[in-house]
């Protein structure tokens, strides 16, 4: 018995070949012997039953001369899953058609971090098929009648080519995923005290009609609890602020991409924030973490100090050096100082290996006098 796979709504071609490779009389029937269609010697396709009943069934007249008499079933339905019989040259060929339906839960448009379940349904009691989906960038996910893709990323968006294999027979179908998310899961901004701070939250997708609301919660390093800094609404590309804290006095861009400006970096603002965006008609929220590290260099009496506040990695090195000279002091700590610094331009550096994250300069005029 030959097996043919078909996806609901698409077409399937059931094969029937003559041994003599020439036109001959043939008939396609259901397993209960009801006639579907055939050719009785005049080269004319004869349909069984009423036209409306069999309008989805056809054959390839162009292939008859070569001894091929396929049964084409269009707009496949789940109930088409059954055995079909081709009668020709005093023999019967049985062809088993397995029609499957693909469902995507919760859908093919998802938020970053969500999971997708792809399910194959069928009327027939077939043994477990192999389902495999491959992204154009090479990622492969496989399963049987159920295929799961968890913790989806923005880069999982786009076209996936899927194959269903059963008894070495294959059927292809495609799915286009749209995973909505921010371009970066997290970002870190390094600023000297007093500098203006800009936070950007670009989305990694473009949707013409985008409706939702968002909020930025901030956990300052110096504070015991987090605080809502700003809430906003989003409609298409239009951003409107609903509520903003008085300290700091944030400003938000009125159109996408989401963008916030903090007038100046101060030690009390150093810390980390979480921007959440809830989109209409989507369960769950999008998140982006943002971190602010603030540096201050000061000279008080005979002490030159450099401090950083905010979430720094243990690998980061803080150094104080006189310009064009070796570092006077370097530590994996958040504060370094030099007693009785000599006159000149001093540099405070925050670095990760040989990569300088930020630097602040302070002019020491003479012992105990400074100018930043």
């Amino acid at each position: 018995k030959t097996l043919v796979l078909g996806k609901e709504g698409e077409s399937a071609e059931l094969p029937c070949e003559s041994s003599q490779k020439k036109i001959t009389v043939f008939t396609w029937k259901f397993s209960d012997q009801r006639k579907i269609l055939g050719q009785h010697g005049k080269g004319v396709l004869i349909r069984g039953g009423s036209p409306s009943q069999f309008d989805r069934f056809d054959s390839k007249k162009g292939a008859w001369e070569k001894g091929s008499f396929p049964l084409i079933i269009n707009k496949l339905k789940m109930e088409d899953s059954q055995t079909y019989i081709c009668e020709l040259e005093n023999r019967k060929e049985e062809v088993e058609l397995w029609v499957f339906k693909v469902t995507f839960s919760p859908g093919t448009s998802l938020l970053q971090g969500q999971s997708l379940t792809l399910t194959l349904d069928s009327n027939s009691k077939v043994s477990n098929p192999l389902t495999e989906c491959k992204h154009k960038k090479g990622k492969v996910v496989s399963g049987s009648k159920v295929l799961s893709m968890s913790n989806l990323r923005v880069q999982d968006s786009d076209f996936w080519n899927c194959t269903v294999t059963l008894d070495q027979k294959k059927n292809w179908f495609g799915m286009t995923l749209s995973v909505l998310g921010f371009q970066k899961a997290s970002s870190i901004v390094y600023k000297k005290e007093g500098e203006q701070v800009e936070f950007s939250f670009p989305l990694a997708f473009t949707v013409e009609k985008l409706t939702g609301s968002g909020e930025l919660w901030w956990q300052a390093e110096r504070a015991s609890s987090s605080k809502s800094w700003i809430t906003f609404d989003l409609k298409n590309k239009e951003v409107s602020v609903k509520r903003v804290t008085q300290d700091p006095k944030l400003q938000m861009g009125k159109k996408l991409p989401l963008h916030l400006t903090l007038p100046q970096a101060l030690p009390q603002y150093a810390g980390s924030g979480n921007l959440t965006l809830a989109l209409e008609a989507k369960t769950g929220k999008l998140h982006q973490e943002v971190n602010l590290v603030v540096m201050r260099a000061t000279q008080l009496q005979k002490n030159l100090t450099c401090e950083v506040w905010g979430p720094t990695s243990p690998k980061l090195m803080l150094s104080l050096k006189l310009e064009n000279k070796e570092a006077k002091v370097s530590k994996r700590e958040k504060a370094v100082w030099v007693l009785n610094p000599e006159a000149g331009m001093w540099q405070c550096l925050l670095s990760d290996g040989d990569k300088v994250k930020m630097d602040s300069r302070i002019q020491v005029l003479s012992r105990g006098v400074n100018q930043t």
Epitope: K235, K237, E238, Q251, G253, P263
Partner: antibody, heavy 118, light 107 residues
Framework: EVQLLESGGGLVQPGGSLRLSCSAS????????MSWVRQAPGKGLDWVSS????????YHADSVKGRFTISRDNSKNTLYLQMSSLRDEDTAVYYC???????????WGKGTTVTVSS | AIQMTQSPSSLSASVGDRVTITCRAS??????LGWYQQKPGKAPKFLIS???SLQSGVPSRFSGSGYGTDFTLTISSLQPEDFATYYC?????????FGQGTKVEIK
């Protein structure tokens, strides 16, 4: 063709009120942000107020807050500016402007003149 | 509110000259900046959006650049019809604010 036509300007005494209208045609009025911008004689452009078509949110310059109210009637394709407690410094040509899809004022009316004087 | 400082306030130039007008924002506004041209007794005309994107129908001798706080409008070869007043507008946030204008006059 997109067209904006302002009306309602005139002479008014300090402390008085006036309502400006802007009739729009040639585009789907309800989809766009609409604004009022003014220009005092011999001076530069001064943004007054904006209203979103999508959300209905309104925004006003500090100098007119509490005195001027922007509104719109999408069924009539008309933008309004209700001005009260008028001052000498409100004397200007008032332009109606339409935002484009990127939220820039791309099309402007010819303006209507408001004179506040006793 | 964000302040927009335009310079120079006026300039005299001849036909064929290259003219540059600058606009500085009191805080970062990304590239959310527009440029407008206004002739006496007329409504402003929209020239450039997003700091550098020329509007359709605007001659290619006009160009814009900048990001953050510093922006420039350049007219590569001044034509007689370009004598007018030019305004920058920050469109980053409300309240929208214009520069005070630059009047380009015939030398």
């Amino acid at each position: 063709e997109v067209q904006l036509l302002e009306s309602g300007g005139g002479l008014v005494q300090p402390g008085g009120s006036l309502r400006l209208s802007c009739s729009a045609s040639g585009f789907t009025f309800s989809d766009y942000v609409m604004s009022w911008v003014r220009q005092a004689p011999g001076k530069g452009l001064d943004w007054v107020s904006s209203i979103s078509g999508l959300t209905g949110n309104t925004y006003h310059a500090d100098s007119v807050k509490g005195r001027f109210t922007i509104s719109r009637d999408n069924s009539k394709n008309t933008l309004y500016l209700q001005m009260s407690s008028l001052r000498d410094e409100d004397t200007a040509v008032y332009y109606c402007a339409k935002d484009n899809e990127d939220y820039y004022m791309d099309v402007w009316g010819k303006g209507t003149t408001v004179t506040v004087s006793s | 509110a964000i302040q927009m400082t335009q310079s120079p306030s006026s300039l005299s130039a001849s036909v064929g000259d290259r003219v540059t007008i600058t606009c500085r924002a009191s805080q970062g506004i990304r590239n959310d900046l527009g440029w407008y041209q206004q002739k006496p007794g007329k409504a402003p005309k929209f020239l450039i959006s997003a700091a550098s994107s020329l509007q359709s129908g605007v001659p290619s001798r006009f160009s814009g650049s900048g990001y953050g706080t510093d922006f420039t409008l350049t007219i590569s070869s001044l034509q007689p019809e370009d004598f007018a007043t030019y305004y920058c507008l920050q469109d980053y946030t409300y309240p929208r604010t214009f520069g005070q204008g630059t009047k380009v006059e015939i030398k």
